[in-house]
């Protein structure tokens, strides 16, 4: 089944209903291939294709595709955050697996019997597919938990989670995200928050904000934040710096513009 | 082996309630949903809702909203269906069903949203007659 | 709601025919599809899922295709206890399933 979770976080998502279609554009006319937005996103939208760029929070890559950094990234996460991903061949994944992550555990989960890790079918490692295998193996068992609710924005999805408690560890959340001066606040706070997740161990959803940030790492103009039950988030705007700017909001249907703002 | 075991049939009569329960084993009751899913003799299968094992979340169709709730008790692996206000129409073999958890992997790029319905109960008969 | 229609809703057919069923969403569901298999007095038994996926331990004669609004389950060669109702059931927005089609002996 889909019980095994990944190695890191793990954003647990409701199933999509008709309100939270109701919140959707048409799909776009003309698509090689339909596929949901990114995260827990339940609007369709186009599929990436072969060799196009992709990571976290872009559209997802299409069927047999896998959403990698390349192999000489010294920073594969980061790549992954930032969209500099590539969209590749599922059977190029295999290869890069080792070089991305550690082995998964042998066999053998004292939470979950044989039958568990053998009875359904599972997708396959991406960052952003919908192609899925029936190989359950695939999954490293279970890791962190994130408690997320699918929400729609259109600029980005925002996760807000809950914790019960925080770890104290120090350690950077990968040794390829060290903070650099260079990275602006939202990067900043985006790598402090992602720190506090890596270490916790069970989370539900109460509290943590992770940031849309740009390139260089600031904070885009667009903010959203994830409602419940999957209709869209609450947005707003903001400068660069994160500092909200007034009259720029919604909390229903229709969508806030920021077009006027430099936050880029 | 992992399997549903779902509690024996029912007669009751119009305006009653009833309650299904869903005993699951042989996996990780909270690493899935349970959605309920019944049919009327010689019908066809109509969904009625869902529950998260994980943290009791529901989704409920729309045609039954306010007479059925589902909950779960995470300590005996047993998921529940009850439905009130039984009509004759309401009549039915009740199936529930095990619901991956669709999921995202933050760090790894892991994702799935493989939420067919891989493990069935073997039905409870309802017969709701005056 | 997500109408599912299917067609025919009963077909008869021999052991060794290829059977196809139809399954057509009332909108896009891009790949969001399962089929179910189900005989008389028995739950149903998931077959493919996401279209054209094939649930473990389920043979391989049993196949599944498309993407949007339109769907098939192939049966490449029909055997003794594939006699049964079938069911296409989407998941793009919770669940719904088509109405049924009955293979029945020839």
């Known amino acids: 089944g889909a019980s095994s979770a990944g190695l890191g976080p793990v954003v647990r998502c409701e199933p999509c209903d008709a309100r939270a279609l109701a919140q959707c554009a048409p799909p776009p006319a003309v698509c090689a291939e339909l596929v949901r937005e990114p995260g827990c996103g339940c609007c369709l939208t186009c599929a990436l294709s072969e060799g196009q760029p992709c990571g976290i929070y872009t559209e997802r890559c299409g069927s047999g595709l896998r959403c990698q950094p390349s192999p000489d990234e010294a920073r594969p996460l980061q790549a992954l955050l930032d969209g500099r991903g590539l969209c590749v061949n599922a059977s190029a994944v295999s290869r890069l697996r080792a070089y991305l992550l550690p082995a998964p555990p042998a066999p053998g989960n004292a939470s979950e019997s044989e039958e568990d890790r053998s009875a359904g079918s599972v997708e396959s490692p991406s960052v952003s597919s919908t192609h899925r295998v029936s190989d359950p193996k695939f999954h490293p068992l279970h890791s962190k938990i994130i408690i997320i609710k699918k929400g729609h924005a259109k600029d980005s999805q925002r996760y807000k989670v809950d914790y019960e408690s925080q770890s104290t560890d120090t350690q950077n959340f990968s040794s390829e995200s060290k903070r650099e001066t260079e990275y602006g606040p939202c990067r900043r706070e985006m790598e402090d928050t992602l720190n506090h997740l890596k270490f916790l161990n069970v989370l539900s959803p109460r509290g943590v904000h992770i940031p849309n940030c740009d390139k260089k790492g600031f904070y885009k103009k667009k903010q959203c934040r994830p409602s419940k039950g999957r209709k869209r988030g609450f947005c707003w705007c903001v400068d660069k710096y994160g500092q909200p700017l007034p009259g720029y909001t919604t909390k229903g249907k229709e969508d806030v513009h920021c077009y006027s703002m430099q936050s880029k | 082996e992992v399997q549903l075991v779902q509690s024996g049939a029912e007669v009751k009569k119009p305006g009653a309630s009833v309650k299904v329960s869903c005993k699951a084993s042989g996996y990780t009751f909270t690493s899935y949903g349970i959605s309920w899913v019944r049919q009327a003799p010689g019908q066809g299968l109509e969904w009625m809702g869902w529950?998260?094992?994980?943290?009791?979340?529901?989704n409920y169709a729309q045609k039954l909203q306010g007479r059925v709730t589902m909950t779960t008790d995470t300590s005996t692996s047993t998921a529940y269906m009850e439905l009130r206000s039984l009509r004759s129409d309401d009549t039915a073999v009740y199936y529930c069903?095990?619901?991956?958890?669709?999921?995202?992997?933050?760090?790894?790029?892991?994702?799935?949203?493989?939420?067919?319905?891989?493990?069935w109960g073997q039905g409870t008969m309802v017969t709701v007659s005056s | 709601d997500i109408v599912m229609t299917q067609s025919p809703s009963s077909l008869s057919a021999s052991v060794g025919d290829r059977v196809t069923i139809t399954c057509r969403a009332s909108q896009s569901i891009s790949s969001y599809l399962n089929w179910y298999q189900q005989k008389p007095g028995k739950a149903p038994k998931l077959l493919i899922y996401?279209?054209?996926s094939l649930q473990s331990g389920v043979p391989s004669r049993f196949s599944g295709s498309g993407s949007g609004t339109d769907f098939t389950l192939t049966i490449s060669s029909l055997q003794p206890e594939d006699f049964a109702t079938y069911y296409c059931q989407q998941s793009y927005s919770t669940w719904t399933f088509g109405q049924g089609t009955k293979v029945e002996i020839k």
């Open positions: 069903a095990r619901v991956p958890s669709e999921y995202y992997d933050f760090w790894s790029g892991y994702y799935t949203e493989e939420n067919a319905f891989d493990i």
């Open positions: 996401a279209a054209s």
């Open positions: 529950i998260s094992a994980y943290n009791g979340n529901t």
